[in-house]
């Protein structure tokens, strides 16, 4: 377990022209806040799909009027951290997005009225218990200065932070095969591995994969407070109780989630997943609307003109999902010729070549029979990105390097004899059989069984059959 | 730059028919591949029916029999025909292509877009 830590240092201007109006007037004062939105590994994922790792709301910041005239400076921030704790291991890579708000304040009917600044987001190698990265986003015109860090709770330690750490129970040095834990010296490596789930407030293990619970609290993992009360069924006795166990309050009773959102109970308290438009731990940040401008790539928003209604974005081409976030597949058109294979890259498509083929579509068929030289009279014949020899008479192979023999597939019939000649194959018949393959056999009266004679042929005329 | 501007959207009765066209102009020395995508509300962008990189025709399972796409070469334009139009057919219709430039390089273009509603 461990907490991701984000200062924001500055969110202003940019650098370089065009400089972004300022979000606050004398007519409409404000002040900002921020949320974060963290997620595992490295994967690209859309801005509506869940903060895995989790999320949290900065406080509001100071009340800001522009001075007319002036330009728009850093926008006085709110004070402390961002902190998003988690529960498990820190996955040491994450992604995140860092979105600033801005809250006016002035006499809207229905309270404040919140509107999305920018947005930035990134993805990142961190180690948990190192020193503090700083980085710089930028959102079209504004920029984002700010710091963040991982870093582990008592008594886990590591870069992942789940190596456990215990006081030590001798002065001098740790119990066998324990180390000292860097880079708390004074502290032992801790062997023990509790059962996993057990919860880290109410429960604790003596021995490897156990789960035992403190006072007041009960079940497999110790996250069923129990209450001592006299009752009519009794659940059993407890060593940490007398009497009957009755299950306490659960944290979801009653919905602590607010403006629909749905609670599920998690290993230290309750987790509220909230519909879209809804922030916060309980959905209590209020909704988008489209005059917070949720819809990225130029959507355009209609509907969702108070935060009870949905808002709809109608994506521009080439862009889908609930906020315009997504690019569509434009590889379902199969731009890419020859077999190529299809990559959307987002800013282009390109083509992936079969071997024998180039170009961005993969449209130029190579030259194969360049520098190819067929053999012995043969001739080179493309096609498919592969090159193939025609050879002449008499000779095989890929190059038409090896002298065929003609007789191996034995041509001549009814017993006649082959002979490989320059031209092809000659055929000595055996007695009573006539033809270039021996076929036709020769009739007892002298006449034979040859084919009718071709046009021009007058029978009894010599007949070539090679 | 080019430009697709397509046409021939509106709203219909089940069971009836229209047509779309979508012209391309403007920088084109060729167009490699051209086709018809849509998006209902709420669900993701298909590709309807399109002319693919090596020439020949794709459909969604979903049309395929009803909707039959064609072309004219010299006018740099393609149709979609619709026939037997369904409810489920209700979406904005995208033209898009992926077309060779003077330049001799490729981009990927997508029109504005129309509306075709089928109801009773």
């Known amino acids: 377990a461990g907490v991701f830590e984000l200062q924001i240092h500055s969110f202003g201007p940019g650098p370089g022209p065009g400089a972004p109006r300022s979000p606050c007037s004398a007519r409409l004062p404000c002040r900002l806040f921020f949320r974060v939105c963290l997620k595992p590994g490295l994967s690209e994922e859309a801005a509506e799909s869940p903060c895995a790792l989790g999320a949290a709301l900065s406080a509001r910041g100071p009340v800001y009027t522009e001075q007319p005239g002036a330009p728009a400076p850093d926008l006085p921030l709110p004070d402390g951290l961002l902190q998003v704790p988690f529960r498990d291991a820190w996955p040491g890579t994450f992604s995140f997005i860092i979105e600033t708000w801005r809250e006016e304040l002035g006499d809207q009917i229905g309270g404040p009225a919140w509107s999305l600044l920018a947005r930035v987001a990134g993805r990142r190698r961190l180690a948990a218990g190192g020193p503090w990265a700083r980085d710089i986003q930028r959102a079209g015109a504004w920029e984002l200065r700010f710091s963040y860090r991982a870093r582990c709770e008592p008594p886990a330690v590591g870069t992942a932070c789940t190596r456990l750490c215990r006081p030590r129970s001798a002065p001098s040095r740790c119990g066998p095969g324990l180390r000292p834990c860097a880079p708390l010296e004074d502290e032992c490596e801790a062997p023990l591995v509790c059962r996993a789930g057990c919860s880290p407030e109410h429960g604790f293990c003596e021995q490897p994969g156990e789960c035992r619970c403190l006072e007041g609290w009960t079940g497999p993992l110790c996250t069923v407070p129990v209450s001592t009360s006299s009752c009519l069924s009794p659940r059993g006795p407890s060593s940490a109780t007398t009497g009957c166990l009755v299950p306490g309050p659960g944290p979801c009773d009653g919905n602590p989630c607010a403006n629909g959102g749905s609670c599920s109970e998690t290993p230290r308290s309750f987790e509220c997943t909230c519909p879209r438009g809804f922030y916060g731990l309980r959905c209590e940040v209020s909704g988008v609307t489209c005059a917070d401008g949720p819809c990225f790539n130029g959507g355009l928003c209609v509907g969702g003109a108070d935060p009870d209604s949905a808002y709809i974005c109608h994506c521009p081409p080439g862009f889908q999902g609930s906020n315009c976030e997504k690019r569509v597949d434009r590889c379902s058109l199969q731009p890419c010729r020859n077999g190529g294979l299809c990559l959307d890259l987002g800013h282009a498509l390109r083509c992936r070549c079969r071997a024998g083929f180039a170009g961005p579509r993969c449209e130029h068929d190579l030259d194969d029979c360049a520098g190819r030289a067929c053999a012995n009279g043969g001739t080179c014949v493309e096609g498919g990105g592969a090159h193939r020899c025609s050879c002449a008479l008499g000779f095989g192979g890929r190059d038409c390097r090896e002298r065929a023999d003609p007789c191996a597939a034995r041509p001549c019939a009814h017993g006649g004899r082959c002979y490989a000649h320059f031209s092809g194959l000659v055929c000595a018949c055996a007695p009573g059989y006539m033809g270039a393959r021996c076929e036709f056999p020769v009739h007892p009266d002298g006449a034979s069984a040859l084919p009718a004679a071709p046009p021009g042929l007058r029978p009894g005329d010599p007949q070539r059959y090679l | 730059e080019v430009q697709l501007v397509e046409s021939g959207g509106g709203e219909v009765q089940p069971g009836g028919s229209l047509r779309l066209s979508c012209a391309a102009s403007g920088s084109i020395f060729s167009i490699n591949a051209m086709g018809w995508y849509r998006q209902a509300p709420g669900k993701q962008r298909e590709l309807v029916a399109g002319?693919?990189?090596?020439?020949?025709?794709k459909y969604a399972e979903s049309v395929k029999g009803r909707f039959t796409i064609s072309r004219d070469n010299a006018k740099n334009t393609v149709y979609l025909q619709m026939s037997s139009l369904r409810a489920e057919d209700t979406a904005v219709y995208y033209c898009?292509?992926?077309?060779?430039?003077?330049?001799?390089?490729?981009?990927?273009?997508w029109g504005q877009g129309t509306l075709v509603t089928v109801k009773p």
């Open positions: 002319f693919t990189g090596e020439g020949s025709t």
């Open positions: 898009a292509a992926d077309v060779q430039l003077l330049n001799s390089d490729y981009e990927f273009y």
